[in-house]
């Protein structure tokens, strides 16, 4: 009862973990323009890792792409990629431990299967989760060092560089819900691992009765008759699932110019 | 369409409070801001204020301590209250709907104070 | 406050004339974030509430003839009508529009001759 309930825990925190990363990196508020000590303008800028936005007090957001690639920093690619494997490997984490979850009957699957695909998701979802606040560590990093470049050009001007009243960036929304999603999903993960070793079925010592024809006396030989655990070569695991996971529909897409809200 | 209209007493006696209401209709106050503008006879523009969709507000420097916006989004309206006025408060008080670059794209005609005794 | 200055303070021009008024902000106007000057430019008729004529510096407002064109960046900006017409007969006013509190420049009076 207690492993269900733990890798059930692991599962629906991973999910949330999961799906807190997918959020945080389609966020657009990764940076957000520093207002403390700063004149009062009246329009408010902050940036994500596929756009830019500027919030104008009259109520007008405009929002532009990065519409390129190698004009990018590499720290912000870093970053994407980061998030994006984070991103797949707990959406794949997600579909293993649907199948090795106790409280699902697929087929005639032995204890032993659902024990391995645990830990396997188990380990996805550690590695998600690492993944995810190394990612905005990497940000975060990048905004303490630059306190946002002096050209406040970092990717959005990639034209002419104009000196102007240098706007500064501090940590956005997403950095918060990047950092607190990744650590679920990482706890989820642990959880998950924890779950696979209840799964795995225990060490069961069977008594022995040997039977001697010939004599009168009984002989009682404890003997150990090894049950598998489901680790070693001889298990009969079938392969559930390939691995393969498309990540297409997981960022959601943005206008491919201007998007006023 | 987009239209503002100000209504005010139109004299007003010095020391005294200015109230004017800007009722706009074609648009919603929780979606744009409303700025205030004020000229006084043959003399340029000046601005005073804007109470923005989120209901913040923002001030002249110079008559902050005088001024006083405010926004009632269901009856479309937004009020401006001038305390202490003189003679050179008297002007032409415009409101003015915030557009794109915080620019104001439509105005109201305005509604001349005159501030005598 | 941002101090906006214009000239001239008035010009006198023929019909069908080129003619160009200045605008000088005491700070630069230009949002990094999407490199767009947040200066305006109204018109405003004798009697008549001010009209937009240009937004971010260079953006027409709709409507607007295309005789109006706006241009510059960070602190200085230029109001150019490319051929003056009967109906210009205006005063002109800039605007800042990105550090509170908002500012307006003296005004241009547009005269024909």
């Known amino acids: 009862m207690a492993v269900t309930a733990c890798q059930g825990l692991g599962f629906v925190v991973s999910l949330i973990g999961i799906a807190g990363i997918i959020a945080a990196t389609c966020m657009d508020q990764w940076s957000t323009q520093d207002l403390y000590n700063n004149p009062v303008t009246a329009v408010f800028n902050y940036q994500g890792l596929w756009r830019s936005c500027v919030r104008e007090s009259s109520g007008f957001t405009e929002c532009r792409g990065y519409f390129t690639l190698l004009g990018l920093p590499a720290m912000l690619q870093a970053v994407r990629a980061l998030m994006i494997v984070g991103i797949v490997l707990g959406a794949i984490g997600l579909l293993v431990s649907i199948f090795a979850l106790k409280c699902i009957r697929i087929g005639s699957m032995e204890d032993s299967a659902k024990a391995n695909m645990t830990l396997t998701s188990g380990i996805m979802f550690i590695v998600s989760g690492l993944c995810a606040i190394a990612g905005v560590s990497v940000f975060a990093n990048m905004l303490v060092t630059n306190f946002w470049m002096s050209t406040a050009n970092m990717y959005t001007g990639m034209g002419g560089m104009v000196q102007t009243v240098q706007t500064r960036y501090t940590f956005g929304a997403a950095l918060f819900v990047g950092w607190v999603a990744g650590g679920l999903t990482l706890i989820g993960g642990v959880m998950m691992c924890i779950a696979c070793r209840g799964l795995a079925p225990e060490e069961t010592n069977y008594k022995a009765v040997s039977y001697h024809a010939s004599g009168h006396s009984v002989a009682y030989k404890p003997g150990g008759f090894k049950a598998s655990t489901g680790f070693g070569s001889n298990t009969k695991n079938k392969k559930i699932y390939d691995g393969g996971a498309r990540t297409e529909d997981e960022v959601q897409s943005y206008p491919s110019k201007h998007d006023y809200v | 369409q987009v239209q503002l209209k100000e209504s005010g007493p139109g004299l007003v006696a010095p020391s005294e409070t200015l109230s004017i209401t800007c009722t706009v209709s074609g648009f919603s106050l929780t979606t744009y801001g409303v700025q205030w503008v004020r000229q006084p006879p043959g003399k340029g523009l000046e601005w005073l204020g804007a109470?923005?969709?989120?209901?913040?507000?923002n001030y002249n420097s110079a008559l902050m301590s005088r001024l006083t916006i405010s926004k009632d989004n269901s009856k479309s309206q937004v009020s401006l209250k001038m305390s202490s006025l003189t003679a050179a408060d008297t002007a032409i008080y415009y409101c003015?709907?915030?557009?794109?670059?915080?620019?104001?794209?439509?105005w109201g005609q305005g509604t001349l104070v005159t501030v005598s005794s | 406050d941002i101090v906006m200055t214009q000239s001239p303070s008035s010009l006198a021009v023929s019909l069908g004339e080129r003619v160009t008024m200045n605008c000088k902000s005491s700070q630069s106007l230009l949002n990094s974030g999407n490199q767009k000057n947040y200066l305006t430019w109204y018109q405003q008729k004798p009697g008549q509430p001010p009209k937009l004529l240009i937004y971010?510096?260079?953006t027409r407002e709709s409507g607007v003839p295309d005789r109006f064109t706006g241009s510059g960046s960070g602190t200085d900006f230029t109001l150019t009508i490319s051929s003056v017409q009967a109906e210009d007969l205006a005063v002109y006013y800039c605007?800042?529009?990105?550090?509170?509190?908002?500012?307006f420049g003296s005004g241009t009076k547009l005269e024909i001759k």
């Open positions: 605007q800042n529009d990105y550090f509170f509190p908002f500012t």
């Open positions: 109470i923005w969709a989120g209901g913040n507000t």
């Open positions: 971010w510096a260079s």
């Open positions: 003015a709907k915030g557009g794109y670059g915080n620019a104001m794209d439509y």
